[in-house]
């Protein structure tokens, strides 16, 4: 039988087959953000470098205007790291003044937007209280998981405070996705 | 037509095909480090277990002398976790003494070395200020992302202070990569 | 030759081939835990949502009674994030009282259970001292790596203190695995 050499020994045929090298993939890296006014209680989205340095998009995975566009339905692994940096958090100042001690926090959310659905879906969230004693602090939040996405879905990364994002190096803050 | 059952319904043929099981893969685990002299401003590289316990290399992905050797070009997912542990950081001692309050830090870098290029390329960095109040502290830094690598590239993990790396358990500190 | 278009140009045939879409995959999300009695020095396992919202299991990857069941041997990428939250840790109270300063900690372990082997195997551990100054603290621990698993292996996520796990949102605490 022709083509039989492709079938596992128990004669089960898996379909469809495709080369791994042609799957949609992207790795985006940080640039200095251009902050704009955003709605209260709505975290601003980051924008990204998609061509230079370590960044790339391939096989119909496109980046436009803060969004990664999903070109075909399937299961994707999605990841992001955001490195935050700041001065002593307000929390420690409040503590010293003896006032109520609500910690500051840093949050990263990977969000899915589907045109047919009015509300964005939060896929992944990393959130951390920041109550640092030192005068300058910095730390990363990393996220990654697998999700079933549909063609046309859009992915973005939102953060609690865009001014705290470390934009200095492409290896510190990044965002990526690939079809499994 | 024989073999047609492998083609997606829209008749697009993807090539080349390959079995997933023969892709280069490695998961390396921590061993106690033998600190060596390293240049100022250059973070030392960790060495790893590549055979025993949870560690393995397969399908031409080889480990030698602190490096994972990339046997074929393609897109790889690369990851590492380093668990650090230490005594109260200098930062808090400095703080108590009323001196300038520059925080200590812990840093992990996944680095690519290409023989044709003299300088290593930092692919991923996780860096965190450490200004702990407790007498003993411990915490992990996790990194993972996808990169386009070339046959012959070498990967290593560098850390800011090798003496702070927790080498006690293979599940706490590790390094891996696999071809997508 | 029919089917030859699937073979790479150098005539090497990779086998067995299979479609990516039929590989075992799961992404599980947090639910409120029902704490049970567990042995001292043994971390309790989390149970998970496996169908609703972002959660799914597919292609013979099944979830039952806190375990993900591995349906076929191979290399799997396994990941989890657990977000912890708590009140001021005991550590700071101890510190204020001038007693020895042993920090509290939070720990996540991804564990493999093999029926033929009496002891569970710890695959991944993320552990962090918690010595927070603020009154309320919260933070995630993320883990992910690749492991060679056997058909019939079972995976679970254990935590140091089930009462500190943030169960409020499916994007904060999750557990997943997929065959590479």
């Amino acid at each position: 039988l022709k083509g039989q050499e492709f079938a596992p020994s128990h004669q089960q045929v898996y379909a469809p087959l495709r080369a791994d090298g042609d799957k949609p993939r992207a790795h985006l890296t940080v640039v200095r953000q251009t902050p704009t006014q955003h709605f209260k209680n709505q975290f601003p989205a980051l924008h990204w470098e998609h061509e230079l340095g370590l960044a790339f998009t391939k096989n119909r995975m496109n980046y436009t205007n803060k969004f990664l566009l999903i070109p075909e339905s399937g299961d994707y692994f999605i990841y992001s790291q955001v490195t935050f940096r700041g001065m002593t958090s307000e929390c420690s100042e409040i503590r010293q003044a003896g006032r109520p001690n609500k910690p500051d926090s840093i949050t990263v959310v990977i969000t899915k937007v589907t045109d047919s659905y009015p509300e964005p879906t939060q896929l992944l969230m990393g959130t951390k209280s920041v109550c640092e004693v030192g005068s300058n602090w910095f730390q990363p939040i990393y996220l990654g998981a697998m999700f079933s996405l549909q063609e046309g879905d859009k992915l973005m990364v939102n953060v609690s405070d865009i001014s705290l994002v470390d934009y200095t190096k492409e290896d510190k803050t990044f965002f990526g996705a690939f079809l499994l | 037509l024989k073999g047609q059952e492998f083609a997606p319904s829209h008749q697009q043929v993807y090539a080349p095909l390959r079995a997933d099981g023969d892709k280069p893969r490695a998961h390396l685990t921590v061993v106690r480090q033998t600190p060596t002299q390293h240049f100022k401003n250059q973070f030392p590289a960790l060495h790893w277990e590549h055979e025993l316990g949870l560690a393995f290399t397969k399908n031409r992905m080889n480990y030698t002398n602190k490096f994972l050797l990339i046997p074929e070009s393609g897109d790889y997912f690369i990851y590492s976790q380093v668990t650090f542990r230490g005594m109260t950081s200098e930062c808090s001692e400095i703080r108590q003494a009323g001196r300038p309050n520059k925080p200590d830090s812990i840093t992990v870098v996944i680095t690519k070395v290409t023989d044709s290029y003299p300088e290593p390329t930092q692919l991923l960095m996780g860096t965190k200020s450490v200004c702990e109040v407790g007498s003993n502290w411990f915490q992990p830094i996790y990194l993972g992302a996808m990169f386009s690598l070339q046959e012959g590239d070498k990967l290593m993990v560098n850390v800011s202070d090798i003496s702070l790396v927790d080498y006690t358990k293979e599940d706490k500190t590790f390094f891996g990569a696999f071809l997508l | 030759l029919k089917g030859q278009e699937f073979a790479p140009s150098h005539q090497q045939v990779y086998a067995p081939l299979r479609a990516d879409g039929d590989k075992p995959r799961a992404h599980l999300t947090v639910v409120r835990q029902t704490p049970t009695q567990h042995f001292k020095n043994q971390f309790p396992a989390l149970h998970w949502e496996h169908e609703l919202g972002l959660a799914f299991t597919k292609n013979r990857m099944n979830y039952t009674n806190k375990f993900l069941l591995i349906p076929e041997s191979g290399d799997y990428f396994i990941y989890s994030q657990v977000t912890f939250r708590g009140m001021t840790s005991e550590c700071s109270e101890i510190r204020q009282a001038g007693r020895p300063n042993k920090p509290d900690s939070i720990t996540v372990v991804i564990t493999k259970v093999t029926d033929s082997y009496p002891e569970p195997t710890q695959l991944l551990m993320g552990t962090k001292s918690v010595c927070e100054v603020g009154s309320n603290w919260f933070q995630p621990i993320y883990l992910g790596a690749m492991f060679s698993l056997q058909e019939g292996d079972k995976l679970m996520v254990n935590v140091s203190d089930i009462s500190l796990v943030d169960y409020t949102k499916e994007d904060k605490t999750f557990f997943g695995a997929f065959l590479l």
Epitope: V31, T34, T36, L52, A55 | E119, Q122 | -
Partner: antibody
Framework: QVQLVQSGAEVKKPGASVRVSCKAS????????MHWVRQAPGQGLEWMGW????????NYAQKFQGRVTMTRDTSISTAYMELSRLRSDDTAVYYC???????????WGQGTLVTVSS | QSVLTQPPSASGTPGQRVTISCSES????????VNWYQQFPGTAPKFLIY???KRPSGVPDRFSGSKSGTSASLAISGLQSEDEADYYC???????????FGGGTKLTVL
């Protein structure tokens, strides 16, 4: 692909003003800071300032404060640099440059020669 | 006021290795990365090296950058006649909130 196309050469008299435009294409205009850099004949590069095309916020080098104004029109993805009270030593090629990774100026316009002569 | 100092000129013969230095007068900016630009006569500068030592795709691997402390350098190995150009280093100056350029180095291939 990213392109920055600048307006043509200008000849101005001392005391006059000049406005140079920079039309961007191939990327989201509002997502990246736009800088202006000038180069006098036979001299090196001199940074003048940047504009945030999203908010319109600006930051000018101290040397040019009070004389330079950077604006943008997002509807046509164009940035502008206006320099007033021109002097002969303002004769230079003026470049717009888009900021990118590592806060580097990753894409540059072709340059606009401004000649100030009485 | 911070200053980046480059030698005004450098030269070499084809095939040689040439190094251009860039030193920072103010250690306050020593923590920020150095970028390098190449400019041919009559054309706009071109992005050459970023983050001290990284090359954008399309830049030949004959070009390499390095940085130690407050001093950076650009090395060109296997010098070619088409490398004759002006080379500028730059770093982000937090006080300026903008890039600070070196004075430039004119490279001549003899």
């Amino acid at each position: 692909q990213v392109q920055l196309v600048q307006s043509g050469a200008e000849v101005k008299k001392p005391g006059a003003s000049v406005r140079v435009s920079c039309k961007a294409s191939g990327y989201t205009f509002t997502g990246f800071y736009m800088h202006w850099v000038r180069q006098a004949p036979g001299q090196g590069l001199e940074w003048m300032g940047w504009i945030n095309p999203d908010s319109g916020g600006t930051n000018y080098a101290q040397k040019f404060q009070g004389r330079v104004t950077m604006t943008r029109d997002t509807s046509i993805s164009t940035a502008y640099m206006e320099l007033s009270r021109l002097r002969s030593d303002d004769t230079a090629v003026y470049y717009c440059a888009r900021e990118g990774i590592a806060v580097a100026l990753t894409y540059w316009g072709q340059g606009t020669l401004v000649t100030v002569s009485s | 006021q911070s200053v980046l100092t480059q030698p005004p000129s450098a030269s070499g013969t084809p095939g040689q290795r040439v190094t251009i230095s860039c030193s920072e007068s103010n250690s306050d900016i020593g923590t920020n990365a150095v970028n390098w630009y190449q400019q041919f006569p009559g054309t706009a500068p071109k992005f050459l090296i970023y983050s001290n030592n990284k090359r954008p795709s399309g830049v030949p691997d004959r070009f390499s950058g390095s940085k130690s402390g407050t001093s950076a350098s650009l090395a060109i190995s296997g010098l070619q006649s088409e490398d004759e150009a002006d080379y500028y280093c730059a770093t982000w100056d937090d006080n300026l909130n903008g890039p600070l350029f070196g004075g430039g180095t004119k490279l001549t291939v003899l």
